[in-house]
Each structure stands twice: as structure tokens, then as C-alpha cells.
């Protein structure tokens, strides 16, 4: 039903979900602090404008009495017992941040009357795709099986001059959130790249996966992973890989690659690792400081969604526009708005664009290195490293497909 | 970064025993490997042995059958169990990790064999 929104005569609220089952196990004070930090900063940037307004937040907790599972398996209802909780208590805000969980957005979106924008820090199924109200400030799984398939497809580059068309999938169900949600949507029948793609098998067991590194009758050369180096040496070990195997290993949350003093280990170097471009400062930032590598994202996706916020409000007060209207709630899309650490794109569909990047592991220096980068807003692959000094031979990467000569 | 201390080194015998020691201030478990190295003077460093945390260990040539790697889960702590020690084994040992994202080295303890 319809809920009062405290959002108007100079004084603007934001309802925070504050759930226990989240895309990250990330200290729900952690999360505040990020929030706070984004209101400091937007009421410095509204008063600034000459908009002489209030802008709070008020964290909803869930009880965790029934709800604890702590991920985002029992989600669902959370967030639909938070709603219910704002709804009695009359306290709902302008704009809605949270939930991060897929089931819980879907749920939420599915099941409630959205005159208001909804912001998530996660939200990355494909159930969540083209959602007029919501807003996704972390790469959702589209965005990646559209860079798979771009570059499944390159095949003028000096380092891959051939066109991809199979893949393995490994996916063995004890993926975080992000990863569970990504790796769904390769395996989806009716997904983008199942469509693009000839092949495509999706392995299960550790054993399975193990077997495929020196199996001799294997159907393609590329197996799709995701998680960090160490989640790739627990299932690989010491593991001898034929040397036409490339693994691409999907990290997107994991600054650390860019870090200094970072050196690969061995099992590295017939592995690209698939991570987001890390911000211009934030890995020195007093923000970022307290957060792992892995957590950074998330705690900024909160604090952006804050100034997402802070933007749209000063635009519609500049505007002389009501904030409590659908044309508010639909209209947090096809923007850039200035986040924490630069600007921040948002397409037509509410979901963040991003550069994703592409590493190798010189045989050389036993460095990470930047093959590729891959801007999602636009679709393009654009070559970082024309010469680089893979373990693959003549430093190309190989067919997909052993034994097939060029297409 | 992980921090690593040696000690057992010291002055020895030709056909004599050392037993070095390497205290590591994490779980060693969850590190990649954990390696021995040794620098002669005026010589590169050069891998001794070296042990992954899936178990596999790889020696120097010169040293196979004489060194052995090994492991205290509980100490956290590694060995390098050297005997049949030559003159050029003589160096300064160092122990070597790497967490799966950087190196990281101890100071380095002396081994002399001499008569």
C-alpha cells in the first residue's frame, strides 16, 4: 500500500535498510559510517547550490530473530518484513538504499507499490535487469556477460586472433553473491551468452574441473571462474595445466591486483583476472582505510548511492519539481553524477558503468599486468599491452578449441 | 605483510648438521609456499627448498637427499634440516614466503662450514 513519505517542506529522508543477510558480510557500522560520510558530503554540496535544506537518514534494522542465516539465502522476507516495519511506522524516505541481496530486491520490487527510487549496493542477478525504479551501483551480471561475449568474439588483437565460441563454466554452489549471481547467469539457457555461445558446459565438482586441466578430449580450452587467487589454488593446488588452458578468473571486487609490492604466485600464470578499474584514490583514501580490498566496493556503493541522491534532490529543488512524484523515482538513470571518488555513470536502466579490466601474469616480472580494458557504457574492448609476455605460446592466446586452425 | 624469523644457523663442521628454523606470524596454512633461500657472498640468491601448501616441495640439485623442507602447522613455524653440509653450503639462509599476493623475506641467518 501506499506509505507517507518524509520528504518534503525543506526536510528529506533516506531509509536505509540496515539487513542482516547481505551481498557482503560487511559490519553493518561499516555501512553506516559510509552513509554518514555521504551525507556530510551532500549537504556540503546542497549548501554549496544555495539549497538551505535537511538531509537525514534513518536505518531500518531488521530484528535477525528469523532471518539470520547472515547471507543472502534467507533474504527474501527480510526485506519485505523491513518494508512492512517502514510502512507501520509511517517512516518511509524519498529513496530507498538497499537491500543488496538479488532475492530480496526481486521480492521487494515484485511486491510493493515502487512510487519511490529504490538504490542497491548489489542486486546483480538478471532478475533484477530493466527495473524502472532501481538503481544498481555495483556491475551487475549483465554488464559481465556482455563483456565475455565481446570479448569471446575479438579476434583482431595482436595477443588474440581468434574468435571464441565455447567455454567451461566451473560453479560449484558455495560462490558469494556476487559470484552466485554471475556465474547463474552464464549458466542461464536463455542468457546473452549462452546464446552466443556453440558450447558451453558447466562443471560442478572440483573433481570435474581437475580432470578438465590435462584432459586431452576436452570440448574448449576456456574455463570461467570467480573469486581470488586463493579460491582458484584450493581447487587447483599443484596442479600440472596444459598449456593451451586459459582460465578466466572473474574478481571484479578485489582492488588488491593494483596494490603495491603485489607479485603473483606461480599457479597465476595461465589465469586472467577479470577486476574492476580501482578508483583514483581510494586505495589511500581515510574512507577505505578500515575496509579489506574485497569490502571497499560494497561500503562505496552505500555512500554513492547517498550522493545519487543528493544530486537528483538538488536538481529537482533547482528545478522547482515535486520530490514525491514518479518522475522523481524514475529519473535516477541514463546519468553521470560526481560519487566519492569521480564521476559515476548510470545507463539507461539504472545500472552502473564501469571500466572493467582484463590482467595477465608476465612471465617476466611475475606482475600483474593490464591486457585490456573494457568500458561497459559503450560496449569496447580497448587493448592496454600490444606485446605481452604470456606463458601461452608465440604470446598469443590460444584457440578455444585445440587442434582447430584459424577462423 | 607476513613476518618471518630465522634462527638456527651457526658455525659447523664439513659432514656435520644444522636444523634451521623459520617462525612465520601467520596461520602457515593459509600462505602459498614457504621457501628456503641462500645468498653466498658475491653469488645471486638461489632457491634451497621450497614447499607449496598443497604439499609439493622442490630442492636445489646441489642439495637433494641432503636438505629437507618441513612444517609445524601448529608452531606455524618451517625447518630446513640440513646435513652432509660442504663448504659451499656456506651462506646466508633466508626464509621466503608468499601469501598469495606478496613476498615476503626474513633477515637471514648465517651458515659457515668450515674445519
Known amino acids: 500500500s501506499q506509505v507517507s513519505q518524509n520528504c518534503h517542506n525543506g526536510s528529506y529522508e533516506i531509509s536505509v535498510l540496515m539487513m542482516g543477510n547481505s551481498a557482503f558480510a560487511e559490519p553493518l557500522k561499516n555501512l553506516e559510517d559510509a552513509v554518514n560520510e555521504g551525507l556530510e558530503i551532500v549537504r556540503g554540496r546542497l549548501q554549496n547550490a544555495g539549497l538551505n535544506v535537511t538531509v537525514n537518514a534513518t536505518f531500518m534494522y531488521s530484528d535477525g530473530l528469523i532471518h539470520n542465516s547472515g547471507d543472502c539465502r534467507s533474504s527474501t522476507c527480510e526485506g519485505l518484513d523491513l518494508l512492512r516495519k517502514i510502512s507501520n511506522a509511517q517512516r518511509m524516505g524519498c529513496v530507498l538504499i538497499g537491500p543488496s541481496c538479488t532475492y530480496s530486491t526481486f521480492q521487494m520490487y515484485l511486491d510493493t507499490e515502487l512510487s519511490y527510487p529504490m538504490i542497491s549496493a548489489g542486486s546483480f542477478g538478471l532478475s533484477c535487469d530493466y527495473k524502472e525504479t532501481l538503481t544498481r551501483l555495483m556491475s551487475p551480471a549483465r554488464k559481465l556477460m556482455y563483456f565475455l561475449v565481446n570479448f569471446w568474439k575479438t579476434n583482431d588483437l595482436p595477443f588474440k586472433t581468434y574468435s571464441w565460441s565455447t567455454s567451461y563454466v566451473y560453479k560449484n554452489g558455495t560462490e558469494t553473491e556476487d559470484c552466485f549471481w554471475y556465474l547463474n547467469a552464464l549458466e542461464a539457457s536463455v542468457s546473452y551468452f549462452s546464446h552466443e555461445l556453440g558450447f558451453k558446459v558447466v562443471l560442478r565438482q572440483d573433481k570435474e574441473f581437475q580432470d578438465i586441466l590435462m584432459d586431452h578430449n576436452r570440448k574448449s580450452n576456456v574455463i570461467i571462474m570467480c573469486g581470488g587467487p586463493e579460491f582458484l589454488y584450493k581447487l587447483k593446488g599443484d596442479r600440472a595445466v596444459a598449456e593451451d588452458i586459459v582460465i578466466i578468473l572473474v574478481d571484479l571486487f578485489n582492488d588488491q591486483y593494483f596494490e603495491d609490492n603485489v607479485t603473483a604466485p606461480d599457479y597465476m600464470k595461465n589465469v586472467l583476472v577479470l577486476t574492476l578499474s580501482p578508483g583514483n584514490s581510494l586505495l589511500n583514501s581515510s574512507f577505505s582505510r578500515n575496509l579489506s580490498p574485497t569490502k571497499r566496493d560494497f561500503a562505496l556503493a552505500y555512500l554513492n548511492g547517498i550522493l545519487l541522491f543528493g544530486h537528483m534532490l538538488k536538481i529537482f529543488l533547482e528545478n522547482g519539481e515535486n520530490i514525491t512524484t514518479p518522475k522523481f523515482a524514475h529519473a535516477f538513470r541514463n546519468l553521470t553524477f560526481e560519487g566519492y571518488d569521480g564521476p559515476v555513470t548510470l545507463d539507461d536502466w539504472g545500472d552502473v558503468d564501469s571500466t572493467m579490466v582484463l590482467l595477465y601474469t608476465s612471465v617476466d616480472t611475475k606482475k600483474y599486468k593490464v591486457l585490456l580494458t573494457y568500458d561497459t557504457h559503450v560496449n569496447k574492448t580497448y587493448p592496454v599491452d600490444m606485446s605481452p609476455t604470456f606463458t601461452w605460446k608465440n604470446s598469443k592466446l590460444p584457440n578455444d578449441i585445440t587442434g582447430r586452425g584459424p577462423q | 605483510q607476513v613476518q618471518l624469523v630465522e634462527s638456527g644457523g651457526g658455525l659447523v663442521q664439513p659432514g656435520g648438521s644444522l636444523r634451521l628454523s623459520c617462525a612465520v606470524s601467520r596461520n602457515i596454512a593459509s600462505l602459498y609456499r614457504v621457501d628456503w633461500y641462500r645468498q653466498a657472498p658475491g653469488k645471486q640468491r638461489e632457491l634451497v627448498a621450497g614447499r607449496t601448501s598443497g604439499g609439493t616441495t622442490t630442492y636445489l640439485d646441489a642439495v637433494e637427499g641432503r636438505f629437507t623442507i618441513s612444517r609445524d602447522n601448529v608452531k606455524d613455524t618451517v625447518y630446513l634440516q640440513m646435513n652432509s653440509l660442504t663448504p659451499e653450503d656456506t651462506a646466508v639462509y633466508y626464509c621466503?614466503?608468499?601469501?598469495?599476493?606478496?613476498?615476503?623475506w626474513g633477515q637471514g641467518t648465517q651458515v659457515t662450514v668450515s674445519s
Open positions: 621466503h614466503a608468499h601469501d598469495h599476493w606478496r613476498d615476503s
